[in-house]
């Protein structure tokens, strides 16, 4: 509607690790003569309507989501409604509603995309001594509190991918922070290098671990 | 229980003006949008604006603009629909509607509570 | 203007399981639309059935159920009873305002 006022929010989901502060950005146009008095600003849960933080009857209201929750105070009157989330976890993932009541009232939502790097695979063999080419080997590879859910790829020491006999599974503890096991079988050549790479889809981070078999004895390349 | 209770039914001369009330009663804490939805014979549902009485803040749809005036009174727990330079096509029953602008409840129903409707007839 | 697409009749059998769609002209529907389905029987006012996409309003029977198919909001009613024979509205949610669909005329034979 004509004069309504326009809520403006980021259209690509706002990106923050685990662990940092997010700030969900939302402004508005004030017109001339615009005072905080005038202004009722509210922050929700997109979905259920939940209150996350408000600002009504001229003053901050403070944080109705777990008190990690504030506004910047002296920018409000500039029309910036941005909310700060501090120390974002999984389970704050998901879209937030700007709501701005001005003479009118308009409202706009934000993504927060949660994430987490995953650390370095370690590398397990099974079995791991006595191994001669034609044998079968179990290689595991092993990434931990990463987020969202990894993409795994396996490759040979030329390079080329190994799809078949993988078997990937990824369990979330507590904090919704992913471990993935991957678990290759494998029938040992001459010798050969075996590579993982866990994708964190979101943070485009890599993270690799191989191990590389010679027959006689096994080496694990150092730790990067 | 939520209920909103509208005014009676209303017969106007074209160029006049109508005003219907919207009294909710039971429950109304919160943050509430009164959404006005009027609706011609044979046609379908129809938004006309809506307002926020803890704010007193109001928004109009575009065709509305200019003719219609929404105001609420917080101490009665009442909404208004002024609708002015009636037509002959603004015979109609109009509705007000509640929805949360924050759900108390921690779930969004949305304009889960209606009004009985006002008939409203245009006519010389 | 914001154009909202419904089937304009649907018609079903007792028992059976019926989707009425609601599409934007805006594009694909998002639980920011918070989708409502309105069901209107002749003399009656309307009455809320879904709001937020998929919440039941109370005294709404668990067989309406609201969601998201492909793009558009949709309204599931499983095992469809007599009674359900109306008009089915949806309402979409934009920054500040509500636009209503046509309406779907359910019809139960």
């Known amino acids: 509607p004509t004069g309504a006022v326009e809520v403006q929010v980021p259209e690509d989901p706002v990106v923050a690790l685990v662990g940092t502060d997010a700030t969900l950005r939302c402004s508005f146009s004030p017109e001339p003569g615009f005072s905080l008095a005038q202004l009722n600003l509210i922050w929700q849960l997109t979905d259920t309507k939940q209150l996350v933080h408000s600002f009504t009857e001229g003053r901050d209201q403070g944080s109705a989501y777990a008190n990690r929750t504030a506004l910047f105070p002296d920018l409000l009157a500039q029309g910036n409604a941005s909310l700060r989330l501090q120390r974002v976890r999984v389970a704050d993932e998901g879209s937030f509603t700007c709501f701005v009541s001005i003479r009118d009232f308009g409202s706009a939502a934000v993504s927060l995309q949660v994430a987490a790097p995953y650390s370095k695979p370690s590398m397990t063999l099974e079995p791991n001594k006595d191994l001669r080419p034609g044998d079968t080997v179990t290689i595991t590879c092993s990434s931990y509190r990463g987020y969202p859910e990894a993409e795994v790829f396996w490759q040979d020491g030329q390079g080329v991918p190994l799809t078949g006999n993988v078997t990937t599974s990824q369990m979330a503890n507590e904090q919704g922070l992913f471990d993935v096991h991957s678990v290759l079988r494998v029938v040992l050549g001459a010798n050969g290098t075996y590579s993982c790479l866990v994708r964190n889809p979101v943070l485009q981070q890599d993270a690799h671990g191989s191990v590389t078999i010679t027959g006689q004895p096994m080496t694990f390349p150092p730790e990067a | 229980q939520v209920q909103l209770v509208q005014s009676g039914a209303e017969v106007k001369k074209p160029g006049s003006s109508v005003k219907v009330s919207c009294k909710a009663s039971?429950?109304?804490?919160?943050?509430?949008?009164i959404n006005w939805v009027r609706q011609a014979p044979g046609q379908g549902l129809e938004w006309m604006g809506g307002i926020i009485p803890l704010f007193g803040t109001a928004n109009y749809a575009q065709k509305f603009q200019g003719r219609v005036t929404i105001t609420a009174d917080e101490s009665t727990s009442t909404a208004y629909m002024e609708l002015s330079s009636l037509r002959s096509d603004d015979t109609a029953v109009y509705y007000c509607?509640?929805?949360?602008?924050?759900?108390?409840?921690?779930?969004?129903?949305?304009?889960?509570?209606w009004g009985q409707g006002t008939t409203v007839t245009v006519s010389s | 203007d914001i154009q909202m697409t419904q089937e304009p009749s649907l018609t079903t059998s007792p028992g059976g399981t019926v989707t009425l769609t609601c599409r934007s002209s805006t594009g694909a529907v998002t639980t920011s639309n918070y989708a409502n389905w309105v069901q209107e029987k002749p003399g009656q006012a309307p009455r809320g059935l879904i709001g937020g996409t998929n919440k039941r309003a109370p005294g709404t029977p668990a067989r309406f159920s609201g969601s998201l198919i492909g793009g558009k909001a949709a309204l599931t009613i499983t095992g469809v009873q007599p009674e359900d024979e109306a008009i089915y509205f949806c309402a979409l949610w934009y920054s500040n305002l509500w636009v209503f669909g046509g309406g779907t005329k359910l019809e139960i034979k």
């Open positions: 509607a509640r929805d949360q602008v924050v759900a108390t409840s921690g779930v969004n129903f949305g304009m889960d509570v």
């Open positions: 039971g429950g109304t804490s919160g943050v509430a949008l």
